[in-house]
Interface confidence: low
């Protein structure tokens, strides 16, 4: 091991403060006590350290906590978080939502980095499920977060968390993901009345089975074409012309513009021409 340089007389840091920005890297290494740094991590962010100086501070923490940092330090990492590798983060055990928020704030406005992805993965695994508060937090920082999860990961979302999901959070979800989320949403919103229920469930209908679509067609919901186009083809095919007409209400005219696209194309091919003609849209089966 390389012999450590001694701290020059009078330069031992009694606390983490602005004077340290004038220390050379070797002076920071020699003169800043790691345990002091750990208890005053919250001050590091307020001091304009260079990237090189932050590297030294990280090294000191790594020496103090070779098996990973305690959450009391992690919560105050601030910009030092950007210096962490996914390997560093895998050693952590983050359980406090405040800690998660503090670190996501540091990365705000940027794409989800490998560090952030690892942090979120550690956090969610530690909690055992994606509870509502966590989901609220993650979707606020990363609206596409939910759709980045595998169906297996989504299965850990409890129905109560679905209340935190906004329509835009589901924009990039594929049918396999909606298949997992829809039954949870159905359970979460089951006590709402017809029109309120439809407003809430609408974004999840890409996972709905035929029988639920049939039930909705009896409730004057006036589904828009954008929602209809996201429905599962296998769920739409068994619907009758009358049921689709009731489901779409005044939006039924939009079928003409979508007649070459799935699921409308496949549905049209399954219908009797006489039934299609009752719509008066010139749809050809």
């Amino acid at each position: 091991e390389v012999e450590k340089t001694a701290c020059p007389s009078g330069k031992k840091a009694p606390e983490i403060d602005e004077s340290l920005i004038f220390y050379k890297k070797w002076e920071l290494e020699a003169c800043v006590d790691a345990a002091l740094l750990a208890t005053q991590m919250d001050r590091v962010n307020a001091i304009p350290f260079t990237y090189e100086q932050l590297d030294v501070l990280k090294h000191k923490l790594d020496e103090l906590y070779p098996q990973g940092y305690p959450e009391s330090v992690i919560q105050h990492l601030g910009y030092l978080f950007l210096k962490m590798s996914p390997e560093d983060i895998r050693k952590w055990n983050v359980t406090s939502l405040e800690t998660l928020k503090a670190l996501l704030e540091v990365n705000k406005g940027h794409e989800m980095s490998p560090q952030v992805a690892t942090l979120i993965d550690r956090f969610v695994k530690g909690r055992g499920q994606l509870d509502k508060d966590t989901l609220d937090t993650l979707t606020a920082f990363y609206p596409g977060y939910l759709c980045s999860l595998s169906p297996e990961e989504l299965s850990s979302v409890p129905p109560s968390s679905i209340w935190a999901v906004r329509p835009q959070d589901l924009d990039t979800c594929d049918p396999r993901q909606l298949d997992v989320l829809y039954p949870k949403a159905r359970l979460a919103f089951q006590n709402m009345n017809g029109s309120e229920y439809f407003v809430k469930i609408q974004s999840f209908l890409g996972g709905a089975p035929t029988e639920d679509l049939k039930a909705l067609s009896q409730q004057n919901v006036s589904m828009d074409l954008a929602t209809f186009m996201k429905l599962r083809t296998d769920a739409v095919l068994p619907l009758t012309v009358a049921e689709v007409q009731k489901l779409l209400g005044p939006h039924v005219e939009g079928l003409k513009a979508e007649e070459r696209h799935r699921p409308v194309r496949d549905w049209i091919l399954r219908q009797r021409q006489d039934d299609l003609d009752t719509l008066g849209l010139g749809l050809q089966g």
Epitope: A38, T39, P70, E71, Q75, S96, A102
Partner: antibody, heavy 115, light 107 residues
Framework: DVQLQESGPGMVKPSQSLSLTCTVT?????????WHWIRHFPGNKLEWMGY???????NYNPSLKSRISITHDTSKNHFFLKLKSVTTEDTATYYC????????WGQGTTLTVSS | DIVMTQSQKFMSTSVGDRVSITCKAS??????VAWYQQKPGQSPKALIH???NRHTGVPDRFTGSGSGTDFTLTISNVQSEDLADYFC?????????FGGGTKLEIK
């Protein structure tokens, strides 16, 4: 030398709110550290309640989250604990303390919740 | 929450003896543990942190050791003024949690 001193009412009735003050001398609460409230129950159990950091951010024990609020008055170098809807279960000695593995503790103030 | 267990509620020792007080964490807390001494009628006093560093002014007869889930506070050459409650704290995760305490009695 850093010193912390708790002050409060000594007795509170059930369902009322409890307010405690921690006066810090010898160190500015805006200079660093987390500033904690911890309580010690009669049966010898210690419970961490939460903290306010030098910058004003807070973190609370989830078991108390709906009832607890920690604030500070930086001009007076004080920080405060407010606990709503107290019950006899909140009878304890309340300590304020500095730092993550707290290095300085106040003398404690005993609170009895009784009608 | 992480549970910190001090299985010995009371320990009896004599002046000059060496005594070890143990603390077990319900999960791996690495080295994020501190030890405190509380004498009758006084507030807790920080002894050891991380988990083998003595706080300023703490006599060197107090030593801490351990990592992961098992931690020990050792007092060598016990003095009569060491009569007190001793408890551990983990700060690896929030909420911070304490052990139930071990009361050291001097024969």
């Amino acid at each position: 030398d850093v010193q912390l001193q708790e002050s409060g009412p000594g007795m509170v009735k059930p369902s009322q709110s409890l307010s405690l003050t921690c006066t810090v001398t010898g160190y500015s609460i805006t200079s660093g550290y987390d500033w904690h409230w911890i309580r010690h129950f009669p049966g010898n159990k210690l419970e961490w309640m939460g903290y306010i950091s030098y910058s004003g951010s807070t973190n609370y024990n989830p078991s108390l989250k709906s009832r607890i609020s920690i604030t500070h008055d930086t001009s007076k170098n004080h920080f405060f604990l407010k606990l709503k809807s107290v019950t006899t279960e909140d009878t304890a000695t309340y300590y304020c303390a500095r730092g993550t593995g707290p290095d300085y503790w106040g003398q404690g103030t005993t609170l009895t919740v009784s009608s | 929450d992480i549970v910190m267990t001090q299985s010995q509620k009371f320990m009896s020792t004599s002046v000059g003896d060496r005594v070890s007080i143990t603390c077990k964490a319900s999960q791996n807390v690495r080295t994020a543990v501190a030890w405190y001494q509380q004498k009758p009628g006084q507030s807790p006093k920080a002894l050891i942190h991380l988990p083998s560093n003595r706080h300023t002014g703490v006599p060197d007869r107090f030593t801490g050791s351990g990592s992961g889930t098992d931690f020990t506070l050792t007092i060598s050459n016990v003095q009569s003024e060491d009569l007190a409650d001793y408890f551990c704290l983990q700060h690896w995760n929030y909420p911070l949690t304490f052990g139930g305490g071990t009361k050291l009695e001097i024969k």
